[in-house]
């Protein structure tokens, strides 16, 4: 009888020990299985989960625009006053709804190439007005002409055309015209076959971004989605030195197993440069734990504050000998047009940049850029890309529309907020397929280990108690 009981207790302890050992073994084995599955599923090739979502994003992406409506155009043109602006928006478009095209796998160098078609559909229900709403904005052609043609002879010629076309420093344009293009009356008088259509994003619809060539991760998962080349080149030819490099991914995904200590590098064709994000916080996105990576202020700092940025300072006059910060001259990437990119409302920009503009209210929460990355897969499940488009306008003695200006202005035209969040259905699917399975495996591991240890300890204590009782 005593033997049966003791044997039972020993058996219980053994079973507990086995369960605990099995739970313990399951931890590295399970992790290995998860890693193997993740590695298989994030590869960019036909049949994987990643590939399906990569070809055509399952996320609805919106691009909201706020236009800076100039309140005192005549005063600025005549007296070189501060520019008073009032933002109007949002005007929302659906973007990135088109699948990648010309997808070609290269099995030799383990890359996949593609182009990303551009398209934008206006969403009236998510907008404060229509595409026909009018705004007073800087005359893009008049501001750019003397910057492109710094030759005084040609400026006299251009002045004749500006006067003839009755153009001035500011103009009134509809949202549709401003964003997607309008026939400029001044440029239309140039007697040579030049493009006379002007728009902040012209041309956009029916164009493509790329060709991108990215690593598919088949041979090395830590390189998955990293851009190997853009438009057939490994460099951009816009910046000197290492600033010209194409680093990281396109920000839609990153190599898996993202750690908080990692700096996420990505290339954005919108800003004609590679940039980076650092860990900000852990958040819960529809039940999925994600890491929020944010663009740090020092990404936009002057070389004085961040020496790594020295090669992004390509001109010395407007930048006050590279001491100004928070604006990026991307003219080289925009056919020499005086286009400057910044964060909305000149967030993280030096006071000299925003001083000539009234009506700006920078706000970290509203105007910063972030990426919410699921750390196991490296997928970006939510993002907000915020940037502002500005045009430099300088005094030009030979151009009557600009001759009264006493200083250069970096004039805000608009700012945009491009956002995407994983849909509820997709989030559920993601939880079921990825985080759910990992959670379940973790729970099984912990349960086995816990139950095993408890059983082993309980049965061993019972066995020992029994033994000492029998001994007495």
């Amino acid at each position: 009888m005593g033997c049966d009981r003791n044997c039972g207790l020993i058996a219980g302890a053994v079973i507990g020990a086995v369960l605990a050992v099995f739970g313990g073994i399951l931890m590295p084995v399970g992790d290995m299985l998860i890693e193997k599955t993740i590695k298989r599923e994030v590869v960019l090739e036909e049949g994987t989960t990643a590939f399906k979502n990569w070809v055509k994003t399952g996320t609805t992406v919106y691009r909201q625009f706020w236009i800076f409506d100039v309140q005192n155009p005549d005063d600025v043109a005549k007296n070189s006053s501060k520019i008073k602006v009032k933002q109007r928006g949002p005007y929302t478009y659906r973007v990135r709804y088109l699948a990648k095209e010309n997808i070609t796998q290269d099995p030799e160098d383990h890359t996949v190439s593609f182009v990303q078609p551009n398209g934008a559909i206006f969403e009236p229900s998510l907008s404060v007005g229509t595409e026909d709403d009018n705004f007073t904005v800087l005359n893009l052609a008049v501001a750019a002409a003397p910057h492109i043609y710094q030759n005084s002879f040609v400026q006299v010629v251009l002045n004749s055309l500006i006067k003839k076309s009755k153009s001035s420093m500011f103009q009134t344009r509809s949202l549709k015209e401003l964003l997607w293009g309008y026939k400029d009356p001044f440029l239309s008088l140039v007697p040579y076959p030049i493009s006379t259509t002007v728009g902040v994003f012209y041309p956009y619809n029916d164009t493509v971004d790329g060709v991108y060539k990215v690593f598919n991760g088949k041979d090395n998962i830590s390189k998955v989605a990293i851009i190997e080349s853009y438009k057939g080149k490994r460099n951009l030819s816009y910046w000197p030195s290492y600033c010209d490099m194409i680093n990281g991914t396109d920000a839609a995904s990153f190599p898996p197993f993202v750690e908080k200590s990692r700096t996420l590098r990505f290339f954005s064709s919108d800003i004609c440069r590679s940039i980076y994000a650092v860990f900000g916080s852990e958040i819960d996105l529809k039940g999925i734990p994600v890491y929020r990576f944010v663009l740090p202020a020092n990404a936009f700092a002057s070389p004085l504050q961040n020496p790594d940025n020295h090669c992004f300072c390509t001109e010395k006059v407007i930048s006050n000998n590279c001491t100004s910060y928070g604006v990026l001259d991307i003219g080289k990437c925009k056919e020499g047009k005086p286009v400057y990119i910044s964060l909305p409302h000149f967030l993280h920009a030096s006071p000299d940049v925003s001083e000539p503009i009234e009506g700006l209210h920078p706000n970290e929460d509203e105007h910063r850029t972030y990426l919410d990355v699921e750390p196991i897969t490296g997928f970006t499940l939510q993002f907000a890309k915020r940037l502002q488009v500005n045009i430099l306008v300088k005094p030009a003695r030979k151009i009557e529309a600009l001759k009264n200006l006493k200083r250069p202005y970096i004039v805000p035209i608009l700012w945009l907020n491009e956002t995407g969040t994983i849909g509820d259905e997709k989030a559920e699917m993601f939880k079921t397929q990825v985080t759910g399975k990992i959670k379940l495996l973790g729970m099984v591991e912990m349960a086995l280990l816990g139950i095993g240890v408890v059983m082993f300890v309980a049965f061993m204590i019972s066995y020992c108690a029994c033994k000492s009782k029998n001994g007495k």
């Epitope: 710094q150 030759n151 005084s152 002879f153 040609v154 006299v156 010629v157 002045n159 004749s160 055309l161 006067k163 003839k164 008088l189 140039v190 007697p191 040579y192």
Partner: antibody, heavy 117, light 107 residues
Framework: EVQLVESGGGLVQPGGSLRLSCAAS????????IHWVRQAPGKGLEWVAW????????YYADSVKGRFTISADTSKNTAYLQMNSLRAEDTAVYYC??????????WGQGTLVTVSS | DIQMTQSPSSLSASVGDRVTITCRAS??????VAWYQQKPGKAPKLLIS???SLYSGVPSRFSGSGSGTDFTLTISSLQPEDFATYYC?????????FGQGTKVEIK
């Protein structure tokens, strides 16, 4: 086809006047503007006067300022150079030329102006 | 006014020779320089604009280089029809100014 034809040259006494014409075809002078360039016998080229597109501006070399006037009749697609108070040193072949960005892509055949007593 | 100084004022060369004519501006004119060819009794003909841009219909043996103040016209292999006078011109500032010319003669 773009063509420029000058006329109006000839012999004139010092202090006299002459009006040169430049008839353009194949393009509108209004859109481009017209220049007059002269070449004294055996010498180099000298830029004389310019009328900018749409008549928005006129410019003269110091040597002719106050004596020469450039104008255009857009209905006739013709440019003119009114030359007053002519001097012996104004003797030259006068060319009209088309330019937009400051280089001359089309030239007329030239008309000779001789200032002599 | 911007002075354009051409050198040499004349040169003798043979068919097939490589010929180089230089032009110096008295101040920076960026790349706003044109080159012309003129034959006796004829109007000048545009060869090059923006210092390096070959005008349509001009043979590729003609090329231009330079930026700022120093400019060069090169004829890679002189042909019989190339014997003429060559002028540089700055089209940066009014008054537009020409070099004094370089006469290319048969050796």
């Amino acid at each position: 086809e773009v063509q420029l034809v000058e006329s109006g040259g000839g012999l004139v006494q010092p202090g006299g006047s002459l009006r040169l014409s430049c008839a353009a075809s194949g393009f509108t002078i209004d859109a481009f503007g017209i220049h007059w360039v002269r070449q004294a016998p055996g010498k180099g080229l000298e830029w004389v006067a310019w009328i900018a597109p749409y008549g928005g501006y006129t410019y003269y070399a110091d040597s002719v300022k106050g004596r020469f006037t450039i104008s255009a009749d857009t209905s006739k697609n013709t440019a003119y150079l009114q030359m007053n108070s002519l001097r012996a040193e104004d003797t030259a072949v006068y060319y009209c030329a088309r330019s937009f960005f400051g280089y001359f892509d089309y030239w007329g055949q030239g008309t000779l102006v001789t200032v002599s007593s | 006014d911007i002075q354009m100084t051409q050198s040499p004022s004349s040169l003798s060369a043979s068919v097939g020779d490589r010929v180089t004519i230089t032009c110096r501006a008295s101040q920076d004119v960026s790349n706003w320089v044109a080159w012309y060819q003129q034959k006796p009794g004829k109007a000048p003909k545009l060869l090059i604009s923006y210092a390096t841009s070959l005008y349509s219909g001009v043979p590729s043996r003609f090329s231009g280089s330079g930026s700022g103040t120093d400019f060069t016209l090169t004829i890679s292999s002189l042909q019989p029809e190339d014997f003429a006078t060559y002028y540089c011109q700055q089209h940066s500032n009014a008054p537009l100014t020409f070099g004094q010319g370089t006469k290319v003669e048969i050796k």
